[in-house]
């Protein structure tokens, strides 16, 4: 049985997938920051899990997924203070009791060293310094992705 | 409604201890940051300490580092403050007050719990 | 740190006196300023949060705004439970910092 958060997490992806595909992101739009191939959005207001996935999701964007360490620090050095905190893409799944994020897969272990309680309704936050278990009802900041679409040259078929 | 009470505070000698606790009631305790905020006699406010949710995160003044501890036992829905190696400039009133993360205000205070140190 | 500067320090006025304080800020704070209200032997009150949101339950006399480093708390019409001392706080970064405090007296 899925939590109302597993639910709306789903939920999201799947109309996510449903849309027509949209022209590839050459450029992050106006306030948007390009990490690498990606273009983050650090909220300035204050949700809870749930609600930053939703904003996300109109943004046409999702909640941060970090691939790996590496990702983790270089998106760190853009907090400017210890005492922010921001929710990523990661919520616990009551049903596979695994950390998972929202685009399905599971947290490899060696991924994030996470601070505090894997259990129904803990959902991931990132700092300056850590990554840390919150109850997903509580209402921080929130950072979203855009992935950049890397630019090819075009190959034309002979007319 | 919302409360938080504050107790533990008295009379200690520079140098001494003393813990204080904050019992909160009227909301989902291990859903807020929370943070202890103090005021001199007859002075202003001053940040002391701050917690996250879920305890995993602290923060401190500088005036503080070291000789204070913040936590928090959401099984009691209580935030402590321990404070040891007290100086004379630690007398205030301490509150307790919801809040925390940045950008937080402190929404809601107790009623605050007077330490005073002096030999 | 971040440094936060009220004036004046003490001010006197009269019931329905309209009464303005103001906070200044170190460097760019943002909209990120808190007014509090205290009196004397309580606890303090939030009354603006954000610079410029009335907090729930508080007189829609109080009004906040500014953004960057200068900020204003005005009451609009002053009542006789409004004396008291008033405070600004930033939440930008940490330490968290307060005003040194505004005393509204009986004129």
């Known amino acids: 049985q899925k939590s109302s958060i597993e639910k709306c997490s789903v939920d999201i992806q799947q109309s996510r997938n449903k849309t027509t595909e949209r022209p590839g992101l050459l450029n992050c739009p106006i306030y948007w920051q390009q990490l690498r191939e990606k273009c983050l959005l650090f909220s300035h207001t204050v949700n809870p899990w749930n609600n930053s996935l939703a904003d996300c999701s109109t943004k046409e964007s999702s909640l941060l997924l970090i691939r790996d360490k590496d990702e983790l620090i270089h998106t760190q050095n853009l907090i400017r203070d210890k005492a922010i905190l921001f929710w990523i893409g990661l919520n616990f799944s009551l049903s596979e009791k695994n950390w998972k994020w929202i685009n399905g897969s599971f947290l490899n272990s060696n991924d994030l060293e996470i601070r505090g309680d894997a259990k129904e309704n803990s959902c991931i936050s990132i700092s300056q310094t850590s990554v840390y278990s919150e109850y997903c009802s509580t209402e921080i900041r929130w950072i979203c992705q855009k992935e950049l679409t890397p630019v090819r040259n075009k190959v034309y078929p002979d007319s | 409604e919302v409360q938080l009470v504050e107790s533990g505070g008295g009379l200690v000698q520079p140098g001494g201890s003393l813990r204080l606790s904050c019992a909160a009631s009227g909301f989902t305790f291990s859903s807020y940051a929370m943070s202890w905020v103090r005021q001199a006699p007859g002075k202003g406010l001053e940040w002391v300490s701050a917690?996250?949710?879920?305890?995993?995160?602290?923060y401190y003044a500088d005036s503080v580092k070291g000789r204070f501890t913040i936590s928090r036992d959401s099984s009691k829905n209580t935030l402590y403050l321990q404070m040891n190696s007290l100086r004379a400039e630690d007398t205030a009133v301490y509150y307790c007050?919801?809040?925390?993360?940045?950008?937080?205000?402190?929404?809601?205070w107790g009623q605050g719990t007077l330490v005073t140190v002096s030999s | 740190d971040i440094q936060m500067t009220q004036s004046p320090s003490s001010l006197s006025a009269s019931v329905g006196d309209r009464v303005t304080i103001t906070c200044r800020a170190s460097q760019s704070i943002s909209s990120y300023l808190n007014w509090y209200q205290q009196k004397p032997g309580k606890a303090p009150k939030l009354l603006i949060y954000a610079a410029s949101s009335l907090q729930s339950g508080v007189p829609s006399r109080f009004s906040g705004s500014g953004s960057g480093t200068d900020f204003t708390l005005t009451i609009s019409s002053l009542q006789p439970e409004d004396f008291a001392t008033y405070y600004c706080q930033q939440t930008y970064s940490t330490p968290l910092t307060f005003g040194q405090g505004t005393k509204v007296e009986i004129k």
């Open positions: 007050a919801r809040g925390g993360y940045l950008p937080d205000a402190f929404d809601y």
């Open positions: 917690i996250s949710g879920s305890g995993g995160s602290t």
